[in-house]
């Protein structure tokens, strides 16, 4: 992938819109289709004031851990869906799109150099454990996906891309 493709705002925008659309088709988070078991996902909350002052390396760790857990969560949802009788086709389609989207974003971030931030020297303080929560519906899962892209991922790539422009 071209090194700074993720710095083209249209790229991330496409995935954000796909995630929001997936959330919308699941008929609301209260009454939409349920997951047959709870799935652990990253907590997507961003403390705007503290995030802005985090080292870009710390941001990278949070983004990378979140992306990894989110990918596992959506693969788990895909497996649960495959095991259910007559899974809704639209749901299947959006799960497949999310998996493909997360794979692409992971590759783009790798090219951007986000992964090297995880290789911290042995004497550095280990990163704080990733905050997580559990979801019980497909809507909530897609909502976390949309929030993660719109929040931490967009804030992080924005910062890295800005630095690269200097």
């Amino acid at each position: 992938a071209p090194p700074r493709l993720i710095c083209d705002s249209r790229v991330l925008e496409r995935y954000i819109l796909e995630a929001k659309e997936a959330e919308n088709v699941t008929m609301g988070c209260a009454e939409g289709p349920r997951l047959s078991e709870n799935i652990t996902v990253p907590d997507t909350k961003v403390n705007f004031y503290a995030w802005k002052r985090m080292e870009v390396e710390e941001q990278a760790i949070e983004v990378w851990q979140g992306l990894s857990l989110l990918s596992e969560a959506i693969l788990q949802a895909q497996a649960l869906l495959a095991n259910s009788s007559q899974p809704p086709e639209t749901l299947q389609l959006h799960i497949d799109k999310a998996i493909s989207g997360l794979r692409s974003l992971t590759s783009l971030l790798r090219v951007l150099g986000a992964q090297k931030e995880l290789m911290s020297p042995p004497d550095t303080t280990p990163p704080a454990p990733l905050r997580t929560l559990t979801v019980d519906t497909f809507c909530k899962l897609f909502r976390v996906y949309a929030n993660f892209l719109r929040g931490k991922l967009k804030l992080y790539t924005g910062e890295v891309c800005r630095r690269g422009d200097r």
């Epitope: 961003v46 705007f48 503290a50 967009k154 924005g158």
Partner: antibody, heavy 123, light 109 residues
């Protein structure tokens, strides 16, 4: 129930400073950021900046950078907004708003508002 | 800095549906929040995250965000809905909360 009680109206001279307070009750003060928003007569809402009481980090809109200082005193559950070098265009109602993470939001929203403090700048 | 554009005024008859728009570049990529402000009062959050309603806000209030426009829809409009309505987004490129210019909703009759 969350309540934000703001200090009373002020009349100030151009070039002077004003400090508006916002006392919060209900809920844990340090858990929620406080934003300040102003509204000039007959105009819309304008975000000035805010503070995260846990870290003490404040952030300001570009327009007010260097003129506004936002602080928080955890012991009294009070946030403050000080605006210096006042000019007539600063005549406005100044609101504090407490931010809250609603279910499913990645970013806190301005959920609770004070009743506003009218600051009049006049010579 | 990001700009949100709202019509200055919208008029509607009681019992009808009012639609207040808010437009901005690639607005569907943002989460839009809506506030209601009655004369002499502080703003009140009526919709957050495009289409979610805080508790205590009637079901008549709903939101959507697609195309280049976010819309606040108030169905079965009542006289008490007369107010100014503001849309809001967080613009991470400037790290600012941005408000639209506001729309005055007038309930006719």
């Amino acid at each position: 129930q969350v309540q934000l009680v703001q200090s009373g109206a002020e009349v100030k001279k151009p070039g002077s400073s004003v400090k508006v307070s916002c006392k919060a009750s209900g809920g844990t003060f340090r858990s929620y950021a406080i934003s300040w928003v102003r509204q000039a007569p007959g105009q819309g809402l304008e975000w000035m900046g805010g503070i995260d009481p846990i870290s003490g980090f404040a952030d300001y809109a570009q327009k007010f950078q260097g003129r506004v200082t936002i602080t928080a005193d955890e012991s009294t559950s009070t946030a403050y907004m000080e605006l210096s070098s006042l000019r007539s265009e600063d005549t406005a109602v100044y609101y504090c708003a407490r931010e809250l993470y609603y279910p499913g939001t990645w970013m806190a929203v301005m959920a609770y508002w004070g009743r506003g403090t009218l600051v009049t700048v006049s010579s | 800095s990001y700009v949100l554009t709202q019509p200055p005024s919208v008029s509607v008859a009681p019992g009808k549906t009012a639609r207040i728009t808010c437009s901005g570049d690639n607005i569907p990529e943002y989460y839009v929040h809506w506030y209601q402000q009655k004369p002499g009062q502080a703003p009140v959050l009526v919709i957050y995250r495009d289409n979610e309603r805080p508790s205590g806000i009637p079901e008549r209030f709903s939101g959507s965000n697609s195309g280049n426009t976010a819309t606040l829809t108030i169905s079965r409009v009542e006289a008490g809905d007369e107010a100014d309505y503001y849309c809001q987004v967080f613009d991470e490129s400037s790290w600012h909360w941005v408000f639209g210019g506001g729309t005055k909703l007038t309930v006719l009759g």
